[in-house]
């Protein structure tokens, strides 16, 4: 009976940068697979402790495993899998359809190095020439998961990539919030000056890259054919992406009512908890089922705005649908209409 | 943005406790993973402890039952209650944080914080 725990067992992590995190895959008698996160009775939401995960990341040479669970894209090769029984088993397994499998990730710690792994990449003249074509997202201000300028490395070449407001690039943009395992593409961050001056003070490995790439093609599948070597340009604007996995994110509580499960809606930026005002463009459910599940409730069970009759109420305003989609909330100084939440109470 | 800055450091006799915090700017979900690297002089950073979103923990084997790290409710902050201190303990702090998805997870460092063991 193959399961992870058997000293024959075969694994992989694959669609990173690193053997220690990725999708995982298993060899079984007919090849690679990958694993959906809806085996072994598992939703493809929700999933429990990694430390099950163990034996995978020690035989891939790696630390502790510090999270298992849904990818956060799914890539779908020709052959995935569902399993059923014990959790980590793979004796009982069907070929799942490609648009229904979700895959499962997997990350572990990275094993022991003298120094911490950076967010940045080595610097250029370190890759192999051989060493494929990859994307690195470079934060603009003191770090955020999933957010700011792009670098592009190819080979021992690597550099940021000149941007036009007119390039109508959007499936590029999908591509490469793809590509780095970061979701959707959502907007462009405000712009970037590639040839701004250099504080002499600036560590080494943040000084601008030897080159810079312009868009070749905005259709592109694979990164080898999206971009070509351009002269540094000394002014203009780089491309610079949110996508929609980024984090942090924004955090809510509600207030005020009989439970936790309702209340006002608060939204915390910083270290401030603060009012969330109503928006016209979030006026389906949607925001507040996410509302509710971040509580842990259950589903919506009613939301309604409050009269903001008084010209001093104040709050935050996110101009998303969904709370999640909301890199920064703006400040509201007057008529903040408030909006009461009542979740679905899980244990009433 | 990510920030992570540690506090709490400072000389303690051998035999003694010392609690480390690391908060994080920022408000961020819950299903981040934080924990506990150090670092002695002229020796390479090790792993100390970590503790996942949903509250399982991880020790290096040589601090196993005298360090014991927690997080608030909140989740954003850590702290690392060591007891029992050796001066092999003595080392640069560092608090660590990792942001993301299963199989998709960077990590982010705070600047390190000195703790020193000694009578």
């Known amino acids: 009976r193959l399961s992870w725990y058997d000293p024959d067992f075969q694994a992989r992590l694959t669609r990173s940068n690193s053997k220690c995190q990725g999708q995982l895959e298993v060899y079984l008698k007919d090849g690679w697979h990958m694993v959906c996160s809806q085996s072994w009775g598992r939703s493809s939401k929700q999933w429990e402790d990694p430390s099950q995960a163990s034996k995978v990341c020690q035989r891939l040479n790696c630390g502790v495993p510090l999270s298992l669970g849904p990818f956060l894209v799914t890539y779908t090769p020709q052959s995935s899998i569902i399993c059923y029984g014990q959790l980590g088993s793979f004796s009982n397994c069907s070929h799942s359809r490609n648009d229904m499998c979700h895959s499962l990730g997997l990350t572990c710690l990275e094993p022991q190095k003298t120094t911490p792994p950076t967010t940045r990449p080595p610097p250029t003249t370190t890759p192999e020439p051989t060493a494929p074509p990859r994307l690195q997202l470079v934060a603009q201000s003191g770090g955020q998961h999933c957010a700011g300028v792009v670098e592009f490395y190819s080979g021992s070449l690597g550099g940021t990539i000149s941007y036009e407001a007119q390039d109508k690039t959007q499936d590029l943009e999908n591509f490469l919030c793809n590509n780095l395992q970061c979701g959707s593409f959502l907007k462009h961050l405000p712009e970037t000056e590639a040839g701004r001056a250099q504080d002499p003070g600036e560590p080494r490995e943040h000084q601008p890259l030897p080159i810079q790439w312009k868009i070749q093609n905005s259709s592109c599948t694979s990164l080898e054919h999206c971009f070509r070597k351009i002269k540094p340009q000394k002014s203009g604007r780089v491309l610079a992406l949110l996508c929609s996995g980024f984090q942090p994110k924004v955090q809510s509580r509600l207030v005020g009512g009989s439970s936790i499960c309702e209340g006002t809606v608060e939204v915390r930026q910083g270290a401030q908890w603060a009012a969330l005002c109503d928006s016209s463009s979030a006026r389906s459910s949607l925001r507040w089922e996410e509302v509710c599940r971040e509580q842990q409730c259950g589903s919506v069970n009613s939301y309604r705005v409050l009269d903001a009759g008084d010209p001093t109420s104040r709050g935050l305003f996110c101009p998303h649908q969904k709370l999640s989609q909301c890199h920064e909330l703006w400040e509201r100084n007057s008529y903040c209409k408030k909006v009461f939440v009542t979740c679905q109470d899980p244990n009433p | 943005q990510v920030q992570l800055v540690e506090s709490g450091g400072g000389l303690v006799q051998p035999g003694g406790s010392v609690r480390l915090s690391c908060a994080t700017s920022?408000?961020?979900?819950?299903?981040?993973?934080m924990g506990w690297y150090r670092q002695a002089p002229g020796k390479e950073r090790e792993f100390v402890a970590l503790?996942?979103?949903?509250?399982?923990?991880h020790y290096a084997d040589s601090v196993k039952g005298r360090f014991i790290i927690s997080r608030e409710n909140a989740k954003t902050t850590v702290y690392l209650q060591m007891n029992g201190l050796k001066p092999e303990d003595t080392a640069v702090y560092y608090c660590?944080?990792?942001?993301?998805?299963?199989?998709?997870?960077?990590?982010?460092w705070g600047q390190g914080t000195q703790v020193t063991v000694s009578s």
């Open positions: 660590v944080i990792w942001l993301g998805s299963p199989g998709a997870m960077s990590d982010y």
């Open positions: 920022g408000s961020i979900f819950s299903t981040n993973v």
């Open positions: 503790i996942r979103g949903g509250g399982s923990t």
